[in-house]
C-alpha cells in the first residue's frame, strides 16, 4: 500500500498534502513545511514532521535533563534541516547563526556554537529509553500482559520489528520501554526506533500524526492502560560532547 | 475466547485461483494483525504473509507476484487470495494471530485443506 | 532467507524419559538479548500449537514437562517427562528476520 488510493489521504502522517498527481494518476502525498514526498505505508521521518510542525508553530516546551551519556529533548522544539532522505541534517543552525551538532533523532549533542562550528557525521542513536508513569489502577498490571500489549502496540501501529523491543520493564508504575537498533541491525524498510519513539510521544500526549486513525487505545487484558508522564533518553553510538561548565550546571 | 474459522474451496483447477476466508471473533481486527501460513506434503510450513491491524500487509517475498490479503473489519473476516495455483501448492492452509508479539503464532484456524489438481 | 535445521526427523523415546529435539539456524536468531525462536506441537489432522516462546518461555496451559533453551543458532525443546500425549511432530519457527521461517518438524514416537 502507498497513500490511500480510493480518497488520497496519507494514512500515516496527516501533516501533508495529497493529490492524485503521482505516476499513472496514483496518490502522492509531500510533508507540509519542506514539500518531500513521503512513503505512506511507513512511519515518516521525525525530521520531516518537525519540519511540518514548525510550519504551524506552537509554543517550545522543555524536558527535564537527565545524567550521564542519556540525552533528553531540552531544546524543545526547532526548524531543522533535512537531507534529502528526510533524515535530520548533523549540523543544525538557527536564524542567528547559532548552530549545534544533533544525533539520529534530532536532539542537541553538543554545546551551541557559531558557523564555523563542525558535525562530522550524523551519530546514530542506537538505544532509546522510553520512561512511563502510569495513573494509578485497582492492582498492578501484569507484567507479561503488559509486555504483550506495548509490543502490539508498537508492531501494529508503528510497525516496528519486535526484535526492535529489546525489554519492557516495569515496577508499578513506572514501566520503562526499552528500543534498540544497531546501524548493522536495521535492513532497508525497517522502521527506525526514533521515528516510532516520536510517533509514541506525541500519541500519549493525544497529538496524533495519524490520518482518521483513533487516539491511542491502550489496554491490558481489558484495563486501560493510561499514561500521567513521559520521558524520554537518547542513547548514541558516540557519547554526546558537551563542556564541563555544562555538566556541571 | 479467540477463535479464528476459516472457509473455502477444497478443490482448485491448476492455474486458477484460490480464495479462503478467516471469519475471527473474540478479538477486534481493528486491533491484531492476521497471518497466513500453509503447511505442504513436502515443504513443511511457510509463512505466506499478514495483514495488520491498519490494514498494512506484508508477504513473503516468494509469493508476492499473486499474493493478495485483505479485510473487512466491520464483518470480523480477512480474505486470502492467491492466483496461478500449480499441483505444488497442495497443502493446509491456515490463518493465525500472534498474542505475545514476538513474532509466534498463538492462534490458529481449523485450516483449510487445498487440492491443485486437474 | 535464515534455515532452520531439524537435524532429526524422527525420534523414539521411552514413556518417562527426556527427549530433547534440537533445532539449529543457519544464523544468528538473537536481537538485544532476546531469542526470536519458537516451539509448536502438532498433531494429526490438527493446527500447530504454541508451546514456547522466545526460546524458553512457556506458553499459557502448556505443562511445566516443556522447557526451551539454546542462544544464536542451537535452540533444545526438551520434554521430561514424555507422556503417550506427546506424540506429535514438534517444529521450531524464528522471526528475527522476514519472512518468518520453520524448521522442517521432528516426529516424536514412543518406543
Known amino acids: 500500500h502507498t497513500a490511500a488510493q480510493d480518497n488520497c489521504t496519507c494514512p500515516t502522517n496527516k501533516m501533508t498534502v495529497c493529490s492524485p498527481d503521482g505516476p499513472g494518476g496514483r496518490c502522492q502525498c509531500r510533508a507540509l513545511g519542506s514539500g518531500m514526498a513521503v512513503d505512506c505505508s511507513t512511519l515518516t521521518s521525525k525530521c520531516l514532521l518537525l519540519k511540518a510542525r514548525m510550519s504551524a508553530p506552537k509554543n517550545a516546551r522543555t524536558l527535564v535533563r537527565p545524567s550521564e551519556h542519556a540525552l533528553v529533548d531540552n531544546d524543545g522544539l526547532y526548524d531543522p534541516d533535512c537531507d534529502p532522505e528526510g533524515r535530520f541534517k548533523a549540523r543544525q543552525c538557527n536564524q542567528t547563526s547559532v548552530c549545534w551538532c544533533v544525533n539520529s533523532v534530532g536532539v542537541r549533542r553538543t554545546d551551541k556554537g557559531d558557523l564555523s562550528l563542525r558535525c562530522d557525521e550524523l551519530v546514530r542513536t542506537h538505544h532509546i529509553l522510553i520512561d512511563l508513569r502510569h495513573r494509578p489502577t485497582a492492582g498492578a498490571f501484569n507484567h507479561s500482559d503488559l509486555d504483550a500489549e506495548l509490543r502490539r502496540l508498537f508492531r501494529e501501529r508503528y510497525r516496528l520489528h519486535p526484535k526492535f523491543v529489546a525489554a519492557v520493564h516495569y515496577e508499578q508504575p513506572t514501566i520503562q520501554i526499552e528500543l534498540r537498533q544497531n546501524t548493522s541491525q536495521k535492513a532497508a524498510g525497517d522502521v527506525d526506533i526514533g521515528d516510532a519513539a516520536y510517533y509514541f510521544e506525541r500519541d500519549i500526549k493525544g497529538e496524533s500524526l495519524f490520518q482518521g486513525r483513533g487516539g491511542l487505545d491502550l489496554r491490558v487484558r481489558g484495563e486501560p492502560l493510561q499514561v500521567e508522564r513521559t520521558l524520554i533518553y537518547y542513547l548514541d553510538e558516540i557519547p554526546p560532547k558537551f563542556s564541563m561548565k555544562r555538566l556541571t550546571a | 475466547e479467540v477463535q479464528l474459522e476459516q472457509s473455502g474451496p477444497g478443490l482448485v483447477q491448476p492455474s486458477q485461483s484460490l480464495s479462503i476466508t478467516c471469519t475471527v471473533s473474540g478479538f477486534s481486527l481493528t486491533r491484531y494483525g492476521v497471518h497466513w501460513v500453509r503447511q505442504s506434503p513436502g515443504r513443511s510450513l511457510e509463512w505466506l504473509g499478514v495483514?495488520?491491524?491498519?490494514?498494512?500487509?506484508d508477504y513473503n517475498a516468494a509469493f508476492i507476484s499473486r499474493l493478495t490479503i485483505t479485510k473487512d473489519n466491520s464483518k470480523s473476516q480477512v480474505f486470502f487470495k492467491m492466483n496461478s495455483l500449480q499441483p505444488n501448492d497442495t497443502g493446509v492452509y491456515y490463518c493465525a494471530r500472534e498474542d505475545r508479539y514476538v513474532g509466534e503464532f498463538a492462534y490458529w484456524g481449523q485450516g483449510t485443506l487445498v487440492t491443485v489438481s486437474a | 532467507d535464515i534455515v532452520l535445521t531439524q537435524s532429526t526427523a524422527s525420534l523414539a523415546v521411552s514413556l518417562g524419559q527426556r527427549a530433547t529435539i534440537s533445532c539449529r539456524a543457519s544464523e544468528s536468531v538473537d536481537s538485544y538479548g532476546n531469542s526470536f525462536i519458537h516451539w509448536y506441537q502438532q498433531k494429526p489432522g490438527q493446527p500447530p500449537k504454541l508451546l514456547i516462546y522466545?526460546?524458553?518461555n512457556l506458553e499459557s496451559g502448556i505443562p511445566a514437562r516443556f522447557s526451551g533453551s539454546g542462544s544464536r543458532t542451537d535452540f533444545t525443546l526438551t520434554i521430561n517427562p514424555v507422556e503417550a500425549d506427546d506424540v506429535a511432530t514438534y517444529y521450531c519457527?524464528?522471526?528475527?528476520?522476514?519472512?518468518?521461517?520453520f524448521g522442517g518438524g521432528t516426529k516424536l514416537e514412543i518406543k
Open positions: 522466545r526460546a524458553s
Open positions: 519457527q524464528q522471526s528475527n528476520e522476514d519472512p518468518r521461517t
Open positions: 495483514i495488520w491491524s491498519g490494514g498494512n500487509t
